[in-house]
Structure formats: C-alpha cells, structure tokens
C-alpha cells in the first residue's frame, strides 16, 4: 500500500543535507517515489515515529535464552522477556541469569523473581531492602 | 524507454570542483530517487549517495560527506552532483541511476569519466 | 561501510551453472530483503539481473537466479553463456539511507 506523505521539519539528522525532509508517518517508510509511502510489512519490520527512511527497521527477534512479551507490529518493535525463572537487570545488555533459589540465612525473601530483577530479600532485623 | 544521458568526460587538476548532469528522459523527472555510484579504474563500483528530485533533499555516504552536493533543474529534468576538493582517488567513473523497487538501481546512465591529475 | 565480499573470480565452462556468494553483515544482507545483483560488461554501465534477493526484472534471463541465506546471498547462473562473461557485483541496502556494493566477482566462461 502506498500512502502520500507529508512535508514536516525534522531539524538536521545526519543523512539529510537539508532539514526539511518528507517524513513518512509510523508504520510506513519512503517509497522509491518521492513523495509517496509504504507500509511496513507485519512482523517483519517497523518504524516507531515519523521518517525519511527508504526501509522499515527489521524486527527483532528474541534470543534463545528470551521470550517475546508483545509481538513486532508496523509501529513498535518485538518486546522480549527473560524466560520464568531468569531475570535480566533493567537496561543490561547481558544474557539472562538464573533466579536466586531463596535468601542467605538471616534474611527474609520481600519480592519475587521477575524477568525484570532477582529476588529481593532484607534482613529478618531491619526493615531496608538489600538486593542480591 | 527510460534513458539517463550523462554529460562528457571530464580532466580537472587536484583540489578543484567538478559538476556532473545526469539528464532523464523517457518518463517523469520527478518520479523516482537518483542515486549516484563511482568506479574506479580496474575497481568496483562504489555508492556515493542519493537524491530527492522533488524537493532537492540529498544522503551521502559518510566518506564524501561535506564534499558533494547534488542539485536539479527540473525545467530541464536533469540532477547534478558536484564533487569538491578533488584528489588523484576521486579518478573514476561517475555513474547516475534511478531508485528502482525493491531499494535497487535500474536504469543507469552510461556514465561519466572524471580524470583528476595535475 | 566495508564492502560485501565476493570472490575475485569464478569460472565454468558453457552450459554449467556457476553459484557467487557475496557475504555481508546482520546489518545489511542479514537484516533486509533488500539484495540486487549487477551484469557488468568491459566499458558498460552496470546491468540489474536480480532485487529483492531472487526476483529478476523483465527482460533479464531465467537462467540468472538469486537466492539468500543468513548474512549471505548468491547468484546462480545456469546454462553458461558466452555473454554471461562480465564482472558481477552484488548490493545491500545496510539501513539508515545508505547502500553498500560487493567488491566484484569476474566471471569466465571457459
């Protein structure tokens, strides 16, 4: 499908010469016809915002250790998770660690594993979280 | 038929400029992407950028960023490139092709000669 | 922006087919469909044989087949012909408006 797009600025993003581009709306990127769009492809690419981009970006797929939370649409990339039992640290690029099986002595689990953090557990004798 | 007619060979001395045409003829200037490939002698051929001809919006590859500029008189349906501060390496010859579906070039002029030497 | 590689040179004798392999990166070959290859003869401009990985525009032989798998895509010529014999470049588009050529494969028909 093509859509006709619209003339916006879009300040100075390093492949255009000039800052007034033609930007395509989310979900579609530049058709080899100026002035004119294409969708992206369901579940295989995307584009999040509006864009001069002569293809949708490839979506991602999850890695093995990783399961998907919400699949690729036109306008949002894949979104994986650790799988049950793993948990990768927000914003960390490192692959998914085991869940700790329960808390050192002295100390008393407050929250479960996710795929988000480790269990968080406190001392049984203060109130502060402690993460391990 | 769709054709791109390039202009004549070029000689120019180092660190001089030189200005490219590339005419289309056959269809509607405006239509598609112009894109702008090089080769040099005995080389491979080397992507050098690209260009809107409706709104004159141009990409480059990073290495010739800040060193060419592409332009377009639609009044006579042909887009220019222009090459600053030229070496003994930008010797090559410059090719012009259209944007065809499926992000590729097709069809192409039949290309210009730059010689740069002093 | 380093170029695909192809290898230098292939050779086959009339009515052979002869398979270029053309390897990039996840970020170009491996990343979009977006996969042309080039005829190009001694003092020619380059020729479109292949897009989109496999498909041929019209025109162009069925003998000239094009096919992708991972970070590598390749062009089969089948049935070898004299006139097949030029130098062939392969393409990606690599993201972000920009395209990146093969170094060339020259092909002999032996």
């Known amino acids: 499908a093509t859509i006709k797009l619209h003339d916006q600025s879009i300040g100075t993003q390093q492949w255009e010469h000039s800052p007034l581009g033609e930007l395509c709306p989310p979900g579609s990127h530049r058709s080899e016809h100026p002035g004119a769009c294409n969708r992206c492809t369901e579940g295989v690419g995307y584009t999040n915002a509006s864009n001069n981009l002569f293809a949708c970006l490839p979506c991602t797929a999850c890695k093995s250790d990783e399961e998907e939370r919400s699949p690729c649409t036109t306008t949002r990339n894949t979104a994986c998770q650790c799988k049950p039992g793993t948990f990768r640290n927000d914003n960390s690029a490192e692959m998914c660690r085991k869940c700790s099986r329960g808390c050192p002595r002295g100390m008393v689990k407050v929250k479960d594993c996710t795929p988000w953090s480790d269990i968080e557990c406190v001392h049984k004798e203060s109130g502060n979280g402690h993460n391990i | 038929e769709v054709q791109l007619v390039q202009s004549g060979a070029e000689v120019k001395m180092p660190g001089a400029s030189v200005k490219l045409s590339c005419r289309v003829s056959?269809?509607?200037?405006?239509?598609?992407?112009i894109h702008w490939v090089r080769q040099a002698p005995g080389q491979g051929l080397e992507w050098m950028g690209w260009f809107n001809p409706i709104s004159g919006t141009a990409g480059s590859a990073e290495k010739f960023r800040g060193r060419v500029a592409m332009t377009r008189d639609t009044s006579i349906s042909t887009a220019y490139m222009e090459l600053n501060r030229l070496t003994f390496d930008d010797t090559a010859v410059y090719y012009c092709?259209?944007?065809?579906?499926?992000?590729?070039?097709?069809?192409w002029g039949q290309g210009t000669l730059v010689t740069v030497s002093s | 922006q380093s170029a695909l590689t192809q290898p230098a040179s292939v050779s086959g004798s009339p009515g052979q087919s002869i398979t270029i392999s053309c390897t990039g990166t996840s970020s170009d070959i491996g990343a979009y469909k977006y996969v042309s290859w080039y005829q190009q003869h001694p003092g020619k401009a380059p020729k479109l044989v292949i897009y989109e990985v496999s498909n041929r525009p019209s025109g162009v032989s069925s003998r000239f087949s094009g096919s992708k798998s991972g970070q590598t895509a390749s062009l089969t010529i089948s049935g070898l012909q004299a006139d097949d014999e030029a130098d062939y470049y392969c393409?990606?588009?690599?993201?972000?408006?920009?395209?990146?050529f093969g170094g060339g494969t020259k092909v002999t028909v032996l």
């Open positions: 092709a259209r944007q065809h579906r499926g992000n590729t070039f097709d069809p």
């Open positions: 056959g269809d509607t200037f405006t239509a598609y992407f």
């Open positions: 393409n990606s588009y690599q993201g972000y408006n920009t395209w990146v």
